[in-house]
């Protein structure tokens, strides 16, 4: 019966990779991640899923948690016990059957009339297995939500399995299997759906191909659409000159008209559903694209993209603090403190460490080339709209950074915020800046909830100083209309550029519809929905696509004119655009954290043939996308049947070994004396936590087979990375699975089903 099984390798980060213990998804599923040797039976955290990566099993260390591109799918609810059946068995007379007796011999299988039993024992109420997976719920949020960010959002509930909207388990209660747990549910789900034979390593989609040297590449602007108006020089005038608040000027300088400088507009959770997926991907004006956060969406996502130029060490420190302070859920805050969103994986996992140091604005007049670190955080607000304000309005600006030849590659030394999350530990390799001649531009598109309503959030350093984000030419919405699709400096595997519908900010996980295989920048369209192949309906997790513009200096230059001129004191610069003043540029560019909270994409309908197929799997080593399971299982691609889900994420056995992910620690800044600068060119610390979004039936993937999001961790590991190809059914809506593990289970099921489809 084995139908061709697609081999979707759902790349799951397993907590083990980070040394996290089993991740307990909030759901009953416990994904045991047996990092080495699945043989250890003890590793079962959650009843259902205990993602236990078996490092032994897979050549690559399964432990690697870093996921280049989490599929928006890893979402599952905890498994509920089914005790009855077992009990039923007990009820049965005990027939001693010799060992080895087969069911047939035992006469089992000869079920007495099912009529008698049909509803009976089988209907036994599920045990308390159902647990809302905090972490997972987070995952369900748009992919890319970072735990920290989310956690910071008190209002950001981890979305439990579909219905469990905001239920957020204590951060400690989050899936313990931070690595696999998140994904495990989806994986499991994929498999549950039909464990298609996933033989062989997960395939890497064409898009899955990682760019060579992506880890080291400093292709910060890969995501930037060259076509997008990014040419405007990052700075129009020194912020100080304007006398405006530093941010304002900076933003203004780089912002492209029509682009909310803020760039971070809370996106209602269901903005995707509300947003017509039909919105032209390329519309330049993004502000209108996003929904105002006021929308009824249960959660609003604020996509904060902080671009931090590389800054000198002394500044970097402040930035580090900034990252923490700026993000809701400052470093000190535990996942609990952070908010429901943290629960996702942080449950017990260490809270993501503060984002890498974000250098403070370089002293005025210093020509420190800064590669802005994009910190894109999508903060989803809980239905009540609460969310950490700081997260809401940051707009990432694109700033051209001239990389100094002599600078060592910058690598965040500190985990990006949320990186502490085992799942997310950033491992992006340090990216060496390209020759100074070619500025790297990381254009981050601020997520727009709507043209208005963008809240600017100023990230403040530990010192409380607001970091100024030097606006880089804001990418036209067309480039990244999607809030979720933040451009991540190179490093991230080329994310399929999906022309975001300008009107429709992708939820962080909503990428599925956006990146079309053919979309530029898309490595090959990879269908990512981890479970996609399997549950077409569920999980069009749209992975925030980190797009790094091509490294080619020319392209970067063309985008932004990089002036050797010292960056103006950004502190004094105020962005004049919109509320972007709050946008704080944090040097160190490269850290893009997209925190996607659960987006209610239930209303979103993707259209077939659209670019919803997010095949791009960021492979950028340093890009850690912690994707919380997006439960796309509900999303069935109506446009295409599961048959369409043949795409194998990563095109091949993509197993991400989280081991690779700790690049930050290893990476040394090469730029100037900014070695301490956490900024890693190419978005060195890019941590995209993608909350799995479960696309329930209301969400329709635009792609024929639903968005297939390939979760591709930068590192390929054998078992560790679940295949996350979940087809988001066009009808599926995004729903948070109770537990990330369950979500992973869902992914497994989807993968399994997908394999069968293969």
């Amino acid at each position: 019966m084995a139908e061709p099984r697609q081999e979707f390798e759902v790349m799951e980060d397993h907590a083990g990779t980070y040394g996290l213990g089993d991740r307990k998804d909030q759901g009953g599923y416990t994904m045991h991640q047996d990092q080495e040797g699945d043989t250890d039976a003890g590793l079962k955290e959650s009843p259902l899923q205990t993602p236990t990566e078996d490092g032994s099993e897979e050549p690559g260390s399964e432990t690697s948690d870093a996921k280049s591109t989490p599929t928006a799918e890893d979402v599952t609810a905890p498994l509920v016990d089914e005790g009855a059946p077992g009990k039923q068995a007990a009820a049965q007379p005990h027939t001693e059957i010799p060992e080895g007796t087969t069911a047939e011999e035992a006469g089992i299988g000869d079920t007495p009339s099912l009529e008698d039993e049909a509803a009976g024992h089988v209907t036994q109420e599920p045990e308390s297995g159902k647990v809302v997976q905090e972490g997972f719920l987070r995952e369900p949020g748009p992919p890319g939500l970072s735990h920290q960010l989310m956690s910071g959002m008190p209002g950001a509930p981890l979305l439990p399995e579909g219905p469990r909207e905001a239920t957020r388990q204590p951060s400690g209660t989050g899936p313990e299997d931070t690595e696999g747990g998140r994904h495990a549910p989806e994986l499991l789900k994929h498999q549950l759906l039909g464990d298609l034979h996933q033989e062989g390593p997960p395939l890497k989609g064409a898009g899955g191909k990682e760019r060579p040297g992506s880890k080291e590449e400093v292709d910060e602007d890969r995501d930037v659409d060259e076509s997008s108006p990014q040419d405007s020089p990052p700075s129009k005038a020194s912020p100080a000159q304007d006398g405006r608040p530093p941010q304002t000027a900076a933003r203004e300088a780089t912002s492209i008209p029509g682009f909310p400088a803020e760039g971070a507009i809370p996106l209602p959770v269901d903005f995707l559903s509300k947003v017509s997926t039909e919105i032209p991907a390329s519309e330049p004006d993004g502000p209108s694209v996003g929904r105002a956060k006021g929308q009824d969406a249960p959660l609003e996502f604020t996509f904060h993209v902080e671009i931090t130029p590389n800054v000198q060490k002394e500044q970097a420190h402040s930035e580090e603090h900034l990252g923490r302070a700026a993000f809701p859920g400052a470093p000190g805050e535990g996942p609990e403190a952070r908010g429901p969103s943290l629960g996702e994986d942080t449950k017990e996992a260490d809270l993501p460490e503060p984002s890498e140091k974000q250098p403070a604005a370089a002293p005025r007049g210093k020509p420190v080339s800064r590669v802005p670190q994009l910190k894109a955080r999508m903060v989803s607000k809980s239905k009540d709209g609460t969310g950490s304000d700081d997260k809401k309005a940051k707009t990432s600006t694109r700033s051209s950074a001239k990389t100094l030849k002599n600078r060592p590659c910058l690598s965040p030394k500190h985990p990006t915020p949320g990186s502490s999350d085992p799942l997310i530990q950033p491992s992006s390799p340090a990216v060496c800046p390209e020759p100074p001649s070619s500025p790297k531009y990381v254009s981050s598109v601020t997520s727009r909830t709507g043209s208005s309503g963008a809240k600017e959030m100023k990230l403040k350093g530990a010192d409380g100083k607001t970091k100024i984000a030097t606006p880089r030419g804001a990418a036209p919405p067309g480039q990244k209309g999607q809030a979720n699709a933040t451009r991540i400096p190179a490093k991230t595997p080329p994310a399929p550029k999906t022309p975001p519908s300008s009107g429709e900010p992708p939820k962080s996980g909503d990428r599925s519809g956006y990146s079309s295989p053919g979309s530029p920048g898309t490595p090959g369209s990879r269908s990512r929905t981890p479970s996609l192949p399997t549950p077409p309906t569920r999980e069009p997790k749209k992975v925030a696509v980190v797009r790094t513009p091509p490294k080619s200096p020319s392209s970067a230059k063309s985008r932004l004119q990089t002036a050797p001129v010292p960056m103006p004191d950004l502190k004094n610069v105020k962005s004049k655009i919109g509320s972007t003043e709050n946008l704080k540029h944090q040097p160190g560019g490269g850290k893009v954290q997209i925190i996607n909270k659960k987006l209610d994409l239930s209303n979103v309908q993707s259209k077939c043939g659209s670019k919803d197929n997010i095949k791009h799997v960021p492979g950028g080593g340093s890009v850690q996308i912690v994707y919380k399971p997006v439960d796309l299982s509900k999303v069935t691609s109506k446009c295409g049947s599961l048959g369409n889900i043949h795409h194998k994420p990563g095109g091949g056995q993509v197993e991400v070994k989280s081991e690779k992910l700790d690049f930050k620690d290893r990476v040394q800044s090469k730029i100037g004396s900014l070695d301490n600068i956490t900024h890693v060119p190419g978005g060195g610390n890019k941590k995209i936590e993608t909350h799995k979004l479960t696309f329930r039936e209301n969400a329709k993937a635009k792609t024929d087979h639903g968005a297939e999001i390939v979760y591709k961790s930068p590192v390929v590991s054998g078992d560790t990375s679940p295949r996350h190809l979940s087809n988001v059914s066009s009808t599926g809506s995004i729903d948070m699975v109770d537990s990330p593990q369950l979500a992973t289970l869902a992914d497994e099921v989807s993968a399994s089903l997908a394999k069968q489809g293969l």
């Epitope: 084995a2 994904m31 994986l187 499991l188 498999q191 549950l192 056995q653 537990s739 993968a751």
Partner: antibody, heavy 116, light 110 residues
């Protein structure tokens, strides 16, 4: 050819641990998930858990506390360990490729009786 | 414990069209196309018929089809054959339970 074979004791005493091993062939436990399902005589199948291709283990919440699934990729085996068994655990235990909704290949099943 | 409810029995004449429903909730059947249908002949292991709610497993006659609408999945046998007499189970990924099977339906060919 894809095959799965359950092996282990057919008789286990109450309170003991039931340990079963599923040896697969024709596919890799690394690339495919292997689920454990049991079916008590005359009852409906019950999903016990699975070893995902990702290496993650998934358990039926109701059994998680007693259930452990491990995978030995080198041996192409997935093992199930159910502790503190009771007579209610008497059933035919199947290992199958897949997780739940798409378990396409099943082992023949091993009837395990829990009896003192 | 069967979370998924199926009619205990269904019968049909040869060549007749028969449908077996599987009702669940948003956490399982309604959760997505994570539904599978199994045919089990007494004494044998279940056989996968449909996976992903509507995809036929390899080797399964095309008379078997599956669909899912909301929280209900349906297995339809367009032209009942004598060999179709068996027990049919739906199974689904359950966000809370991981995997759940239906209560089972005994299909009788008249």
């Amino acid at each position: 050819q894809v095959q799965l074979q359950e092996s282990g004791p057919s008789l286990v005493k109450p309170s003991q641990t039931l340990s079963l091993t599923c040896t697969v062939s024709g596919f890799s436990v690394i690339s495919d998930s292997v689920a454990w399902v049991r079916q008590a005589p005359g009852k409906v199948p019950e999903w016990l858990g699975a070893s995902g291709s990702s290496g993650n283990k998934y358990y039926n919440p109701a059994l998680k506390s007693r259930l452990s699934i491990t995978r030995d990729t080198s041996k192409s085996q997935v093992s199930l360990s159910l502790s503190s068994v009771t007579t209610e655990d008497t059933a035919v235990y199947y290992c199958a490729r897949g997780i739940i909704a798409g378990v396409d290949v099943w082992g023949r099943g091993l009837l395990v009786s829990v009896s003192s | 414990q069967a979370v998924l409810t199926q009619p205990s029995s269904v019968s049909g004449a040869l060549g007749q069209r028969v449908s077996i429903t599987c009702s669940g909730s948003s956490s399982n059947v309604g959760y997505g196309d994570y539904v599978g249908w199994y045919q089990q002949v007494p004494g044998s292991a279940p056989k996968l018929l449909i996976y992903g709610a509507a995809s036929r497993a390899s080797g399964v006659p095309d008379r078997f089809s599956g669909s899912r609408s909301g929280n209900t999945a349906t297995l339809t046998i367009s032209s009942l054959q004598a060999e179709d007499e068996a027990d049919y189970y739906c199974a689904s990924y359950d966000s809370s339970d991981g995997g759940v099977f239906g209560s089972g339906t005994r299909l009788t060919v008249l």
